[in-house]
Interface confidence: low
């Protein structure tokens, strides 16, 4: 166990032309804070991947007030170190991401606003217990100067913080086979007790009580050789003909990774990929607590009072992500029904409804005919969010207020002439045709395709369309 410590020395414009303008001034007061993310190994993972070794946030720096006429100076920094505790062995090689954030001050809607000013990343080899290492990283026109170290927490010592020390039992010497604990010469290396029965030749341990196997050996005590001949499957049955041996339980069996971490086997052990906010060999430690203020955009932090428990950010409307760092396009969920227009006002959603609909989400279909009168005996018909009138004969228009011309549609077929009539229209048919719309031909022999014409009307006479 131990602590990674990061000391920020300065953050400001880098050398050369194109120096950035200050992000803070009398006009835009703001303050800085930093975030560090550590990952084991020399990985080139994306910035969003879990900080498996841990993460930390600095305190907020002092409010920045610029001196008129002075060149853009290094910006004022938060006090103190950024400390990332690690529960297990220090890996020796690690990747880091250091982010510089600006907190805008002033009247904000929904709390302060944050923006990322610069992000630097690197991969380093570092032995625990060594001196401070100095570094300079540039991000665009910005320059970050910092120092870092890894130190073990007693009783752990060594370059990986895996050796344990205890006070000497006698002033002159340590126990058999044990060395003095440099640089604590007055203490002795404590024996590291592996799991009982762990093979001294093929097994080893980095923590008391465990038994981890060297390559080529397996089993709970590392006493079973792994066959090099082909087996049916990596964990296939033992076969006398192939000479395969059944390997012991796989290192990921039973998933040793806590808090939703995913396990992957390595040649000598397993590796946990931890979800955001957790780290450690088995993802058992939460590196960020509510005291670090990890929730952005006014998110409410719950839990995480001590480093061994997780925190959860409850995000305000319009934000999401484990740290409320992402703005939600809430309109993409299409909350407005019936073709309503969605407006994301930041503090609330609004739906602008189409005609005929109402309600917070345009969910109410208004009675289209309520309060709508159709004139001249027309009847109202609902549909599609808009009313329409079915007009009585001789009337038209949206509200049946217009007198219709019954002949406008040329209803008389075969050259018949149309006459408007108070109760409709009358067709005067051309010779050879008959019917209300002159639609029927008169047979040459004088008979018609229709029953005999009503009394008093000859086939050529005008027919009233009722």
């Amino acid at each position: 166990a131990g602590v990674f410590e990061l000391q920020i020395h300065s953050f400001g414009p880098g050398p050369g032309p194109g120096a950035p303008r200050s992000p803070c001034s009398a006009r835009l007061p703001c303050r800085l804070f930093f975030r560090v993310c550590l990952k084991p190994g020399l990985s080139e993972e994306a910035a969003e991947s879990p900080c498996a070794l841990g993460a930390a946030l600095s305190a907020r720096g002092p409010v920045y007030t610029e001196q008129p006429g002075a060149p853009a100076p290094d910006l004022p920094l938060p006090d103190g170190l950024l400390q990332v505790p690690f529960r297990d062995a220090w890996p020796g090689t690690f990747s880091f991401i250091i982010e510089t954030w600006r907190e805008e001050l002033g009247d904000q809607i929904g709390g302060p606003a944050w923006s990322l000013l610069a992000r630097v990343a690197g991969r380093r080899r570092l032995a625990a217990g060594g001196p401070w290492a100095r570094d300079i990283q540039r991000a665009g026109a910005w320059e970050l100067r910092f120092s870092y170290r890894a130190r073990c927490e007693p009783p752990a010592v060594g370059t990986a913080c895996t050796r344990l020390c205890r006070p000497r039992s006698a002033p002159s010497r340590c126990g058999p086979g044990l060395r003095p604990c440099a640089p604590l010469e007055d203490e002795c290396e404590a024996p590291l007790v592996c799991r009982a029965g762990c093979s001294p030749e093929h097994g080893f341990c980095e923590q008391p009580g465990e038994c981890r196997c060297l390559e080529g050996w397996t089993g709970p005590l590392c006493t079973v050789p792994v066959s090099t001949s082909s087996c049916l499957s990596p964990r296939g049955p033992s076969s006398a003909t192939t000479g395969c041996l059944v390997p012991g339980p796989g290192p990921c069996d039973g998933n040793p990774c806590a808090n939703g971490g995913s396990c992957s086997e390595t040649p000598r052990s397993f590796e946990c990929t931890c979800p955001r906010g957790f780290y450690g060999l088995r993802c058992e430690v939460s590196g960020v607590t509510c005291a670090d203020g990890p929730c952005f955009n006014g998110g409410l932090c719950v839990g995480g009072a001590d480093p061994d428990s997780a925190y959860i950010c409850h995000c305000p409307p319009g934000f999401q992500g484990s740290n409320c760092e992402k703005r939600v396009d809430r309109c993409s969920l299409q909350p407005c029904r019936n073709g309503g227009l969605c407006l994301d006002l930041g503090h609330a959603l609004r739906c602008r409804c189409r005609a005929g609909f109402a309600g917070p989400r345009c969910e109410h279909d208004l009675d289209d005919c309520a309060g709508r009168a159709c004139a001249n005996g027309g009847t109202c018909v609902e549909g599609g969010g808009a009313h329409r009138c079915s007009c009585a004969l001789g009337f038209g228009g949206r509200d049946c207020r217009e007198r219709a011309d019954p002949c406008a549609a040329r209803p008389c077929a075969h050259g018949g002439r149309c006459y408007a009539h108070f109760s409709g229209l009358v067709c005067a048919c051309a010779p050879g045709y008959m019917g209300a719309r002159c639609e029927f031909p008169v047979h040459p022999d004088g008979a018609s395709a229709l029953p005999a014409a009503p009394p008093g009307l000859r086939p050529g006479d005008p027919q009233r369309y009722l």
């Epitope: 303008r21 200050s22 992000p23 803070c24 001034s25 009398a26 006009r27 835009l28 610029e66 008129p68 006429g69 002075a70 805008e104 002033g106 009247d107 904000q108 809607i109 929904g110 606003a113 923006s115 930041g346």
Partner: antibody, heavy 119, light 107 residues
Framework: QVQLQQWGAGLLKPSETLSLTCAVY????????WTWIRQPPGKGLEWIGE???????NYNPSLKSRVSISVDTSKNQFSLKLSSVTAADTAVYYC?????????????WGQGTLVTVSS | AIQMTQSPSSLSASVGDRVAITCRAS??????LGWYQQKPGKAPKLLIY???SLQSGVPSRFSGSGSDTDFTLTISSLQPEDFATYYC?????????FGGGTKVEIK
């Protein structure tokens, strides 16, 4: 190409509220000051106030009691309201975009709206 | 509020002349000053920002200099399209304030 298009009522009576809106087309809405500036006929320019995409506002103290600037990031629009107008508020009103810490870099402007206050 | 005093308020010049307009701040404003050109019926146009940086697309005959309290806009060779009114603007502190303007007229 960034464009700022503004609109609003051009003729007001004394004591009414001036209301103008500026829409931003073709550019990011975050990382800028969205500003209102006015110019009385034949006179110089006067800064009214500004808002950031996150809703932080700054107003000219001479107008602060009457002015309100709001932002609608979903529509890339920001608006100006000036209450209790008098003839002294007659001016061409401009919206403009300014960068954070940019050294007076108002690089894009709206076309201007003449607002006349008359009884 | 920071007062911006611009001088002269007007000047007459001929095409090809070298013209200088000055702006003085009532207190130090670093280099947070810009120069704008305005023609009748048009919105102002940014020429110079951060006291001396030439805005993209602006002819190189325009230049700015100065810092803290005293600033100068220089037009090295006046062209016909340069006859307009010029304003300085400080955005060091609130409220932002403009100079009173300098009208450049044809002699």
């Amino acid at each position: 190409q960034v464009q700022l298009q503004q609109w609003g009522a051009g003729l007001l009576k004394p004591s009414e509220t001036l209301s103008l809106t500026c829409a931003v087309y073709g550019g990011s809405f975050s990382g800028y000051y969205w500003t209102w500036i006015r110019q009385p006929p034949g006179k110089g320019l006067e800064w009214i106030g500004e808002i950031t995409h996150s809703g932080s506002t700054n107003y000219n103290p001479s107008l602060k009691s009457r002015v309100s600037i709001s932002v609608d990031t979903s529509k890339n629009q920001f608006s100006l309201k000036l209450s209790s107008v008098t003839a002294a508020d007659t001016a061409v009103y401009y919206c403009a975009r300014g960068e954070y810490g940019s050294g007076s870099r108002f690089d894009y402007w709206g076309q201007g709206t003449l607002v006349t206050v008359s009884s | 509020a920071i007062q911006m005093t611009q001088s002269p308020s007007s000047l007459s010049a001929s095409v090809g002349d070298r013209v200088a307009i000055t702006c003085r701040a009532s207190q130090g404003i670093r280099d947070d000053l810009g120069w704008y050109q305005q023609k009748p019926g048009k919105a102002p146009k940014l020429l110079i920002y951060a006291a001396s940086s030439l805005q993209s697309g602006v002819p190189s005959r325009f230049s700015g200099s100065g810092s803290d309290t005293d600033f100068t806009l220089t037009i090295s060779s006046l062209q016909p399209e340069d006859f307009a009114t010029y304003y300085c603007l400080q955005d060091y502190d609130y409220p932002l304030t403009f100079g009173g303007g300098t009208k450049v007229e044809i002699k």
